[in-house]
Interface confidence: low
């Protein structure tokens, strides 16, 4: 009974009463400095305590800066809509001293025909309509403005773009008499960028387009288009980068083939093939040219679209991604895993690792999980001793002021971090494993035994006794 993880999460606060925005203080710095952790790597706790103390002492000067809430802005151009015709929008928290902008694309699967879109509208309306969106959202993980939670980009301008187009951010069709639903994901991103230019984005130095799950795939599909849009609008100096979390999927053979009946059981290639037609989906131009007409679905798969991208993209992907397993018809239901399934799961990790070998900026822990960057404890997971915020910081440094990653990695500052151990949760910093359906916590040894891994087999390549391995895993988890 293994698989779904729960991350510790801050309790949700009620939205604060409306208040007037403070005007930017005269003489405020135009850019925040990047935090370079090289010198403090050994004593992070002490450093963080100092940062926190500094932040608290500065609080009276800039109370609005430490308010965690992002505020909802529905698009002024109301013709750019969610599935049901309600206006799309974004949540924004400005950081007037910073020239960094983080635009985050939310995830949440997709629908690809009238029937499963109707069903989605009945059960997950928030992902198809803006009518019930809350006035504010709390920024968590990479969207947090607290240095302890977000040592990477805590001082950036934060934008959360809710997913309400059900099209993996690729659609370009409006609602009409013929079309029951609008699919305008690609247009929503363009319109948000256009509106943000009037809210300070025009002065940006770096725009990081990030996203998780379907939002991560959305990054791969839209990052070059955003760069092109800004160039055309006269902002060629804004460096556009991508951060794709849990959106790097494989079009591999399903564990058990099922007919394309609904979103979850439909093979991803078939779902996307149908979806593109239904959404009037658009893919990056350079990728589209590599495939014949009708074969654009290939561009939704990271390892095929990535080599065609011009913007630098950092790929974050669990080697044993739960959404990937779901579309592959692997359901860890509480019954012990059979040998064939265990080998399938291991092979998935191997294939995923292989697709990342030529991706210079990547972070791929050998965990069974899904999504990471807006989890409050996104800093906890490490690959080869490096956390994700640290790897992103190294990536920033490696990019310098250019648009392309430099080929030589910085000494002591790695950006290609892919686990090489071969089984789920062989990385002791993986998030807690929980029963897939009850959420009940398991220790790693229990989980691995349930997955059918013989402790002797797992221990041998490490030169350990099974008992030592169990002790090690239990302590590390």
């Amino acid at each position: 009974s293994e698989g779904r993880k729960t991350w510790r999460r801050r309790g949700q606060q009620p939205p604060p009463p409306p208040r007037t925005e403070a005007a930017p203080a005269a003489g405020q710095p135009v850019e925040s400095f990047p935090l370079d952790f090289t010198a403090v790597e050994g004593n992070m706790d002490s450093f963080m305590a100092q940062v926190k103390s500094l932040a608290q002492s500065l609080y009276p000067c800039s109370a609005q800066q430490l308010n965690e809430d992002l505020r909802l802005h529905l698009l002024l151009n109301t013709s750019v809509t969610c599935n049901d015709g309600s206006p799309a929008g974004y949540y924004l928290k400005e950081s007037r001293g910073s020239r960094r902008w983080l635009l985050f694309l939310e995830g949440g699967w997709y629908c690809f025909n009238r029937e499963n879109c109707d069903s989605r509208y009945d059960t997950m309306r928030r992902l198809m309509s803006s009518r019930d969106w809350p006035r504010t959202r709390t920024g968590t993980g990479i969207l947090s403005s607290q240095p302890e939670e977000n040592p990477y980009w805590w001082n950036a301008n934060m934008v959360f773009i809710p997913y309400c187009s059900s099209d993996v951010w690729s659609g370009a069709s409006s609602k009409s008499e013929k079309n029951e639903y609008a699919f305008m994901g690609a247009l929503i991103i363009q319109e948000v960028v256009r509106e943000l230019l009037g809210r300070g984005l025009s002065g940006a130095k770096v725009l990081l387009l990030a996203g998780s799950s379907a939002g991560g795939t959305g990054v791969l599909l839209n990052v070059d288009r955003v760069a092109e849009q800004l160039e055309k609008l006269g902002y060629p100096a804004i460096q556009v980068r991508g951060l794709a979390d849990s959106g790097w999927f494989l079009d591999n053979k399903q564990y058990r083939h099922t007919d394309c009946v609904d979103t979850i059981t439909c093979a991803p290639t078939e779902a996307i093939r149908r979806g593109i037609r239904y959404w009037n989906g658009v893919v990056p131009e350079r990728c589209r040219r590599q495939f014949q007409e009708g074969e654009e679905w290939n561009c939704f798969f990271g390892y095929k679209v990535y080599p065609t991208l011009r913007c630098p993209v950092f790929v974050v992907q669990w080697l044993f991604d739960e959404a990937q397993l779901t579309v592959d018809n692997v359901h860890l239901t509480g019954q012990p895993v059979q040998e064939g399934l265990r080998l399938y799961i291991q092979n998935l990790g191997r294939e995923l690792r292989h697709t990342l070998k030529d991706v210079p900026a990547s972070f791929a822990p050998a965990c069974l999980s899904h999504e990471i960057i807006i989890r409050s404890h996104w800093t906890d997971v490490q690959v080869k001793g490096t956390s994700l915020p640290r790897a992103l910081h190294c990536w920033d440094r490696s990019l310098h002021d250019s648009h392309k990653a430099s080929k030589t990695p910085l000494k002591g500052c790695p950006v290609h971090l892919v686990d090489s151990c071969p089984w789920p949760h062989c990385n002791p910093s993986c998030p807690t494993v929980r029963d897939q359906f009850t959420g009940q916590e398991m220790n790693v040894a229990q989980f691995l035994m349930h997955m059918g891994f013989d402790m002797q087999t797992v221990a041998q390549p490490q030169g350990l006794e099974p008992s030592e391995l169990l002790g090690m895993l239990s302590n590390g988890s």
């Epitope: 009974s1 999460r9 059960t123 509480g334 009940q440 398991m442």
Partner: antibody, heavy 119, light 111 residues
Framework: EVQLVESGGGLVQPGGSLRLSCAAS????????MHWVRQAPGKGLEWVSY????????YYADSVKGRFTISRDNAKNSLYLQMNSLRDEDTAVYYC????????????WGQGTLVTVSS | DIVMTQSPDSLAVSLGERATINCRAS??????????MHWYQQKPGQPPKLLIY???NLESGVPDRFSGSGSGTDFTLTISSLQAEDVAVYYC?????????FGQGTKLEIK
């Protein structure tokens, strides 16, 4: 017919012990995780303990941890709850319930057995 | 622990009218497209009976006047047209993590 029947309840003094049993029939018992849930007189439902299908995983509510032990015998289609160091606040109807294998909800409940802790 | 709060504590509705019971979780109980929230009905002297599982799925044998909705932290049980046999206490329960806590219950009566 899918059925769960609890037994073993009764009157016991504070500090005493009782062992509850739950007999399952009409389904493959060894395929399902099982829970104990209790309900104090006139009060709401409180989850007590869980055991996975093969007994590999067990969990307890904080209120009973260290005093209660859940176990099962799949050969006998039976679930047990050994209750030691009983307290007044353990007085309740105890239900055994089957965990649906695909969602963590309780799809089959027994009729319950009353445990009264009183001096 | 996730705290489940039901509202109202008690409810009186006329026969044939709609009854709505709300349940709020202290943290999100939805993940990967599923909401781990369930509803039970308990009549006096009887064990609870499963009505709705995973937020909106009707358990087999339960009349279709019962329905469930919601995601994230806020969920609703609706009885579209109250019948005399629906008089009972209703509980919500999450199974997102351990312990799988219940709401305090809502007593439904006929007005």
């Amino acid at each position: 017919e899918v059925q769960l029947v609890e037994s073993g309840g009764g009157l016991v003094q504070p500090g005493g012990s009782l062992r509850l049993s739950c007999a399952a029939s009409g389904f493959t018992f060894s395929d399902y995780g099982m829970h104990w849930v209790r309900q104090a007189p006139g009060k709401g439902l409180e989850w007590v303990s869980y055991i996975s299908s093969g007994s590999r995983t067990v969990y307890y509510a904080d209120s009973v941890k260290g005093r209660f032990t859940i176990s099962r015998d799949n050969a006998k289609n039976s679930l047990y709850l050994q209750m030691n160091s009983l307290r007044d606040e353990d007085t309740a109807v105890y239900y055994c319930a089957r965990k649906h294998y695909n969602g963590g909800y309780f799809d089959v409940w027994g009729q319950g057995t009353l445990v009264t802790v009183s001096s | 622990d996730i705290v489940m709060t039901q509202s109202p504590d008690s409810l009186a509705v006329s026969l044939g009218e709609r009854a709505t019971i709300n349940c709020r979780a202290s943290k999100i109980v939805s993940t990967s497209g599923y909401s781990y929230m369930h509803w039970y009905q308990q009549k006096p002297g009887q064990p609870p009976k499963l009505l709705i599982y995973l937020a909106s799925n009707l358990e087999s044998g339960v009349p279709d006047r019962f329905s469930g909705s919601g995601s994230g932290t806020d969920f609703t049980l609706t009885i579209s047209s109250l019948q005399a046999e629906d008089v009972a206490v209703y509980y919500c329960q999450h199974s997102r993590e351990l312990p799988p806590t219940f709401g305090q219950g809502t007593k439904l009566e006929i007005k």
